[in-house]
Interface confidence: low
């Protein structure tokens, strides 16, 4: 059987190193060797590259080496496959060396800001040594902020043949670290160099970008004053490196600016004690270069009726995100404030908040929340300076089985009945929404029975038991992830009821045990 016709010939010119062609098939059923015929010097010359029978049989690649690598030039390539039964030739292919030239990557030696020029970085690099001197090179500059995985790209060409090259990258963020990498190719080539080693540079610092401002309204105190917890953070889009030296807060009752109070703080939270009227609060951050734009917040009067527009809310999980969606009866509301914090009794919870614009959903990566923790999530509608009534829900990013089962006891033991009571599992041990309880009970040496009840039931009366019989029983609490058995208890049904005993006083000792 003749060898297969060589196809899919692909050639690449590694500048001043070699000219290599590959083809398929890579493997033949029987022993095959190959001959690659080349014409070069614009068709005036020809030579052969052979795969060595002893060591390179069945190897679908061959390289031509200097000094016969001519450039610029057009080559033709034809591959012959030969086995014991004969030879099969490929079609003739044509190659312009300028179009398939691959050169070394450039070497970036400096990424710096230029004094007085905002939001710009100047990149300096050395043109690759192994590149044709006269040719125009095209470049791709890839850049990203240091904490991002998403690369941006800019393409440009350089005609000059100076070894040191420069490019000014503009419209960047202030005071932000950027990672840069560069590749190049001859202008006509389809093959890019590899990427250069990455280099980091930082844009110039500016006055703070801005603040996001929020509040938690607390119940009025006995003296009528209202504690308001103000909190702020760098606005979305602010530079990662931005550091404020401090924050100026001023506030006053509506229409009464002569009662303005001012506060300076270095914290990102501050508790105000306000009267019952409407107040306006303003916060700016500052550094050595100036102040941020003013963040404004209206604190409603104590008796002000807040609007309500969120009608429903759903929390759902995707593979790696928690998504909260809500429906609103007010199409004009397009800004929302989302608060979330763990629902824990013991430790002070970490309170987080985030603004959402022009969407009725909010997404958080699962790994930003703790698995097995219940989170309270509230969404406030914000219409201009008014904040509406929140709508709240709870969510787990990952449920597990409860870390402890319900503590159980048996009460009102009768001849054929018993009332089982169990305690709710503490929040910290639930690890998910308790969806039901299952009571497993079994007479001594008897068959096990079970009864499942809703999660709002903490007591159940078992009936149709056998008189004067020892039973073991436990209650399992289940989340979506599975169930955990609680304390195992034993009880024994009575042999005779109080009524059957003729009304005499019967003191029946029963014990049940915990497991």
């Amino acid at each position: 059987v003749l060898p297969a016709k060589p196809e899919n010939i692909s050639c690449i010119f590694y500048y001043e190193e070699n000219f290599t062609c590959t083809w398929s098939p890579e493997k033949e059923a029987s022993y095959t060797w190959y001959k690659v015929k080349r014409t070069y010097s614009y068709g005036y010359k020809s030579d052969i590259c052979s795969t060595d029978n002893s060591t390179r049989g069945n190897h679908a690649s061959c390289s031509f080496l200097p000094p016969t690598i001519t450039n610029p030039d057009n080559y033709t390539i034809q591959v012959e496959a030969q086995n014991a039964d004969g030879i099969m030739k490929s079609d003739i292919t044509y190659w312009n060396l300028d179009a398939i030239m691959k050169i070394e990557p450039p070497e970036i030696f400096s990424v710096k800001s230029v004094l007085g020029i905002k939001r710009m970085l100047q990149i300096k690099w050395i043109r690759p040594v192994l590149a044709p001197h006269s040719s125009t090179l095209k470049y791709t500059l890839r850049f990203r902020t240091i904490n991002s995985a998403y690369w941006m790209e800019v393409n440009f060409t350089k005609e000059d043949i100076d070894r040191d090259e420069t490019y000014n990258l503009t419209e960047l963020q202030a005071f932000t670290e950027y990672v840069m990498t560069l590749r190049c190719a001859p202008a006509e080539s389809m093959f890019w160099s590899g990427w250069s080693q990455e280099k980091v540079g930082t844009t110039e610092e500016e006055a703070p970008y801005g603040l996001d401002l929020w509040r938690v309204l607390k119940p009025a105190m006995v003296d009528g004053r209202r504690p308001v917890q103000l909190m702020w953070k760098k606005a979305t889009g602010a530079p990662v490196l931005e550091k404020a030296l401090g924050y100026n807060i001023w506030y006053f009752p509506e229409n009464n600016t002569n009662l303005t109070e001012t506060v300076n703080t270095t914290n990102q939270t501050h508790e105000l004690y306000l009267g019952g009227k409407t107040y306006w609060v303003y916060v700016v951050s500052y550094n050595s270069l100036g102040e941020s734009p003013v963040a404004t917040l209206r604190i409603p009067a104590l008796n002000e009726k807040t609007f309500q527009c969120i009608e429903a809310m759903q929390a759902c999980l995707t593979q790696d995100q928690l998504v909260v969606e809500w429906q609103s009866s007010a199409p004009e509301v397009d800004t929302w404030m989302v608060e979330w914090f763990p629902d824990v009794d013991s430790e002070p919870s970490s309170f987080s908040w985030e603004s959402v614009s022009q969407a009725r959903n909010w997404t958080i990566q699962k790994d930003e929340l703790k698995p097995l923790w219940c989170y309270n999530i509230s969404v406030y509608p914000v219409l201009r300076d008014r904040v509406g009534q929140p709508y709240s829900t709870q969510a787990y990013v990952q449920e597990g089985i409860p870390s402890a089962g319900p503590v159980t006891q048996a009460d009102s033991i009768g001849v054929k009945t018993v009332t089982i009571t169990w305690k709710e599992i503490p929040k910290s041990k639930r690890n998910g929404f308790i969806k039901n309880y299952t009571i497993f009970y079994q007479a001594e040496d008897g068959k096990e029975f079970s009864k499942t009840v809703n999660s709002n039931i903490l007591q159940y009366r078992l009936e149709s038991l056998t008189r004067r019989t020892s039973y073991s029983l436990q209650v399992m609490a289940s989340t979506n992830a599975g169930g955990t058995n609680g304390t195992k208890i034993n009880f024994k049904t009575l042999s005779i009821s109080v009524l059957e005993g003729g009304g005499g006083s019967h003191h029946h000792h029963h014990h049940h045990h915990h497991h």
Epitope: A404, V407, Q409, K423, N490, H511, H514, H515
Partner: antibody
């Protein structure tokens, strides 16, 4: 910090009764059971019984039923053990303890109250 | 009620000895056994729960094993600070019951 603080030592005459206290801090007794245990000099531990402070339900070892009474006051976060008709057999150290069912052990103990019954 | 028979009552030891204490339940208690250490004038402290699970912070020279009715508590290399009384306890069935205790004493 989770702690159980017991009342001080008692010297009581035979036939009298005594009420020992156990005050919790760092947790709410309504969220767990409080148990009482007895340890006579140079002897092992005996389980007297326990209370569910959330509803007052109790359970006793039959050996202590009628003799000992366990109560709780959730407003002061305190559990009590009353021992009546005291005899020399009641001379012991009495411990209150919180039981951790999730891992099957007493995870928090009071420091113990020494009760001496003597005429 | 379930009786926990603990042996020995007293155990003379020298530093570096291997200590083995046994507890035999009058009926199966599965693995619902806890071992406690009690030093003079102190409340008991958990060493092992669920028969073989070392409690948080307990040195690994303390081990427990067993299931059903026979349980063993071992101190691989006893140290001076281990002088104490050791109790087993079952919580499989109410009332909870304890072994009578094993007192480690210097030879």
């Amino acid at each position: 910090e989770v702690q159980l603080q017991q009342s001080g030592a008692e010297l009581v005459k035979p036939g009298a009764s005594v009420k020992l206290s156990c005050t919790a801090s760092g947790f709410n007794i309504k969220d767990s059971f409080i148990h009482w245990l007895k340890q006579r000099p140079e002897q092992g531990l005996e389980w007297i019984g326990r209370i569910d402070p959330a509803n007052g339900n109790t359970e006793y070892d039959p050996n202590f039923q009628g003799k000992d009474t366990i109560t709780a006051d959730t407003s002061s976060n305190t559990a009590y053990l009353q021992v009546s008709s005291l005899t020399s057999e009641d001379t012991a150290v009495y411990y209150c303890a919180r039981y951790y069912y999730g891992n099957s052990h007493f995870d928090c103990w009071g420091q113990g109250t020494t009760l001496t019954v003597s005429s | 009620r379930i009786v926990m028979n603990q042996t020995p009552k007293f155990l003379p030891i020298s530093a570096g000895d291997r200590v083995i204490i046994t507890c035999k339940a009058s009926q199966s208690v599965t693995n619902d056994v806890t071992w406690y250490q009690q030093k003079p004038g102190q409340s008991p402290k958990v060493l092992i729960h669920y028969a073989s699970n070392r409690y948080t912070g307990v040195p690994d020279r303390f081990t427990g094993s067993g299931y059903g009715t026979d349980f063993t508590f071992t101190i691989s290399t006893v140290q001076a600070e281990d002088l104490a009384v050791y109790f087993c306890q079952q919580d499989y069935s109410s009332p909870f019951t304890f072994g009578s205790g094993t007192k480690l004493e210097i030879k």
